[in-house]
Structures are given as C-alpha cells and as structure tokens.
Interface confidence: medium
C-alpha cells in the first residue's frame, strides 16, 4: 500500500511488515482465547496451499520505542502497541479437532497515550 | 483485544472495527493491484463456510477526524488515516478465474505526521 | 489584533449553573493552550483550569474540580467553562487567558463576573 | 504544589523611585519557569516578564527580573506614575496546580 514516506509524511509510531508461515507462527490465539496450532497447508481443489500471513507490529529497533512521534509531551505520556486483527486460518484445537478458525495476528502499530498529571 | 480506554489510555486515532462479509464486500484489490470479486462461500470439507472479514479503519464519527489527538500543533500537522493489510480470500479475477488471493482489507486507523514549514 | 473577549457571567444561586465562554481573535486559536483564572473581589489571582490545543488533556484547581468543565471549539475560536453546583466562594471575576507554549499567560481577556448568592 | 509568597503585601514608593519585589517559591522552580504580571484597577492582568527575566513584548526597560531557585526579584528601576498597581508571579514548571503568589500592591508614598 502507498508509502507514507513518499508523501513527505512520517508515521507517529514506526512498523515492521512481514510476511508470516504457518511453519514459523505454530500456535496462535483463536477468538475465544484459546491456544491453536496454525496448521503449515491448506486443502485446496489443486492439492495444498501453504499457509502464511501478513504481520506488522511495532519496530523495535525504530525510533518509537521510547515513546511516539510528534506527541505533545507536556500533557501526555506516550507508547506504540501494537494491535493485533482476526484472520481466518485452518487451525487444530487442544482436542486434535481441525477446522476454520479466526486467530488474532498483529496487523498495526498504533499509539497510545495517558495524560501526565501532576507533574 | 484489551481496551486501551479500560487502563486510562486514549488512542491517538479514533478507529472502528466490523465484521463485513464478502456479500457487503462484493470486490476487492489483489496483491498485484487488479480488482477481483470476492466469493461469499469457501468450500470446506463438511460444506460451505460463509466468507467474511474483519475490519478496522477510522471512525468517521470520532472526535479526530479534525487530526490525531495529542500531537504537538506548534511541529505537526497530523492526519488519522486507515491503513491496509492482506489477508487470503476466495476470489474470481476479470477472467473468471477462482482462486485463493491475497486482498487487501482495511486493518487499522494510525496518525501520519507532516512537519509544519515555514512559521 | 490578538483579543479575548468573556462572556455569561450573572448572578446565580447557589447550586446553580452557568457557561462562560470566551471568543478569540487575531491568532491561531487552535495552535494554544488555554486557560480560566479567576478572582475573588479584593484577592488575588487563582488559577481554575487549563486545556491543551486539541481539548483531550484537562486540568483543573482542585477547588472546581468535578463542579467545572473546559472546554474548545476549534472552528468557532471558542473555549468555555461550564460550572455546575455553584457555590458563594466561586463568586469572581472570571477571565480567559492565552497560554504560551510553557505555560504562562501572554494574552488576557477582560474578564466576566459571576456572583453567586441567593 | 508549589507556594509562592510574595513580599512586602504593600510598597510605597515615590515616582522616580526604584521598586524591588520578592516572590519566594515553597521548592525549586527549575529552568526559571517564572512569570510576573502587572494588574491595574479593573483591568485584566498584563504579562511583564516570562523565564524570570525576559520581558514580553512592549515592556519599556525599566522593567527587569532576576533570580533563579527559590529567590525571584521584580525591580523597576524609576517608577512611572502607570506603575502603580499590583504585582503577581506565577510559577508554571511545576503543574498543575498553576499558581501565583498573593501579590503586592505597589502604592504612591
């Protein structure tokens, strides 16, 4: 998607985007909190399709990790989180049961703030 | 996910999330930037699962709609602006081709900055 | 010209209600900070709550705290004070004031009375 | 918070006079975060010096103010019949609580 940078623009908390295996993710967290196994293929109508996912969070090594950008200071307190999504993914529950299931992924880098009282 | 607002936070950008199907979604962008249809079944193994996504983008009614909250007027101007990510879904191409493609969906609400010139 | 020009001061009963507002000109209003000080006939000058330039962040003397609300709108260079279950000690001159960026007040209105008694 | 007390409550003074008022703060008021302001009856206060020692734009010269810590001066150094008046400092390193001192009334002697 277009690059924020080539407008002249910068991002109040800088992020990293990659692109996720199943082989590398293993488990992941479904929308009632529990622990799945993201399953490495998917069963398509061809044979098999590996799965993967496109994952941003929050850079550790960019220059937010202090707090965020362009934040007034003298009222507030700041930090980049990242946000996670749901995506669907052929998953296996804790009781060997396979099947779709909305797992979270981290897909932002957003910021938050809390206000500094009483400095 | 944990509400920010629950720990005394504030988000810089005012976001809303849905779940939108692929019948209220109809078309989508591709990875190679082509508009694909977006299927509303997938098959499964038992059947069909409904096709759906989870969606997060600005909220048009927030209160930063004006610019991001928090943000140091004196350096930045600021803007909250959606932002996108990929997920797979079941889709047809111009030429009716099905297949399994990477879409683009809306994933998140973050601030971009851009620094004021000249005061 | 940079002005600040009060207004909605009145005579109110105790436990009443009243807004002042306060209209800004000749500067960016959304660019500053701002604030309410008030003063007692015969006293000195008593901070009683400032606002940021967006209106998110908010503070306020612990006198009018949960009684009083700041408040900003942006596009019509307006800031506010609603002040509720008035009482006989907040009888004051109420003025509006510019903030520069560290807090201190450039700019001052002419100030608006609010009695409180019965 | 911090308390500042300002001295003498009252000044009297001649025109033509130098007038030097102090205002003490309860703790540290670190990279001289203090102002003075000047209140003429039934008027709005007039900010004369910011940082402890600059003076805002269209003070006339014969204002100045000094100090640092704990310790600020307001001096003026030939007093004009318009100098008359009250005199506050306010404190804005350490907020909120903004606060000012109680003033002191400058007075023809």
């Known amino acids: 998607h277009s690059d924020p940078a080539r407008r002249g623009e910068l991002s109040v908390c800088d992020s990293i985007s990659e692109w996720v295996t199943a082989a590398d993710k293993k488990t992941a967290v479904d929308m009632s909190g529990g622990t799945v196994t993201v399953l490495e293929k998917v069963p398509v109508s061809k044979g098999q399709l590996k799965q993967y996912f496109y994952e941003t969070k929050c850079n550790p090594m960019g220059y937010t990790k202090e707090g965020c950008r362009g934040i007034d200071k003298r009222h507030w307190n700041s930090q980049c989180r990242t946000t996670q999504s749901y995506v669907r993914a052929l998953t296996m529950d804790s009781k060997k049961r396979i099947g779709w299931r909305f797992i979270r992924i981290d897909t932002s880098c957003v910021c938050t703030l809390t206000i500094k009282r009483g400095r | 996910h944990s509400d920010p607002a629950r720990r005394g936070e504030l988000s810089v950008c005012d976001s809303i999330s849905e779940w939108v199907t692929a019948a209220d979604k109809k078309t989508a962008v591709d990875m190679s930037g082509g508009t694909v249809t977006v299927l509303e079944k997938v098959p499964v193994s038992k059947g069909q699962l409904k096709q759906y996504f989870y969606e997060t983008k600005c909220n048009p009614m927030g209160y930063t709609k004006e610019g991001c909250r928090g943000i140091d007027k004196r350096h930045w101007n600021s803007q909250c602006r959606t932002t996108q990510s990929y997920v797979r879904a079941l889709t047809m191409d111009s030429k009716k081709r099905i297949g399994w493609r990477f879409i683009r969906i809306d994933t998140s609400c973050v601030c971009t900055l851009t620094i004021k010139r000249g005061r | 010209e940079v002005q600040l020009l009060e207004s909605g001061g009145d005579l109110v009963q105790p436990g009443g209600s009243l807004k002042l507002s306060c209209a800004a000109s000749?500067?960016?209003?959304?660019?500053?900070?701002m604030s309410w000080v008030r003063q007692a006939p015969g006293k000195g000058l008593e901070w009683v709550s400032a606002?940021?330039?967006?209106?998110?962040?908010?503070y306020y003397a612990d006198s009018v705290k949960g009684r009083f609300t700041i408040s900003r709108d942006n596009s019509k260079n307006t800031l506010y004070l609603q002040m509720n279950s008035l009482r006989a000690e907040d009888t004051a001159v109420y003025y509006c004031?510019?903030?520069?960026?560290?807090?201190?007040?450039?700019?001052w209105g002419q100030g608006t009375t609010v009695t409180v008694s019965s | 918070e911090i308390v500042l007390t300002q001295s003498p409550a009252t000044l009297s003074v001649s025109p033509g006079d130098r007038a030097t008022l102090s205002c003490r703060a309860s703790q540290n008021v670190r990279s001289s975060k203090l102002a003075w302001y000047q209140q003429k009856p039934g008027q709005a206060p007039r900010l004369l010096i910011y940082?402890?020692?600059t003076r805002a734009t269209d003070i006339p010269d014969r204002f100045s103010g000094s100090g640092s810590g704990t310790d600020f001066t307001l001096t003026t150094s030939s007093l004009e019949p318009e100098d008359f008046a009250v005199y506050y400092c306010q404190q804005y390193y350490d907020w909120p609580p903004l606060t000012f001192g109680g003033g002191t009334k400058v007075e023809i002697k």
């Open positions: 004031a510019k903030l520069d960026y560290y807090y201190y007040m450039d700019v």
């Open positions: 000749g500067f960016t209003f959304d660019d500053h900070d």
């Open positions: 606002t940021s330039t967006d209106g998110y962040a908010t």
């Open positions: 940082g402890a020692s």
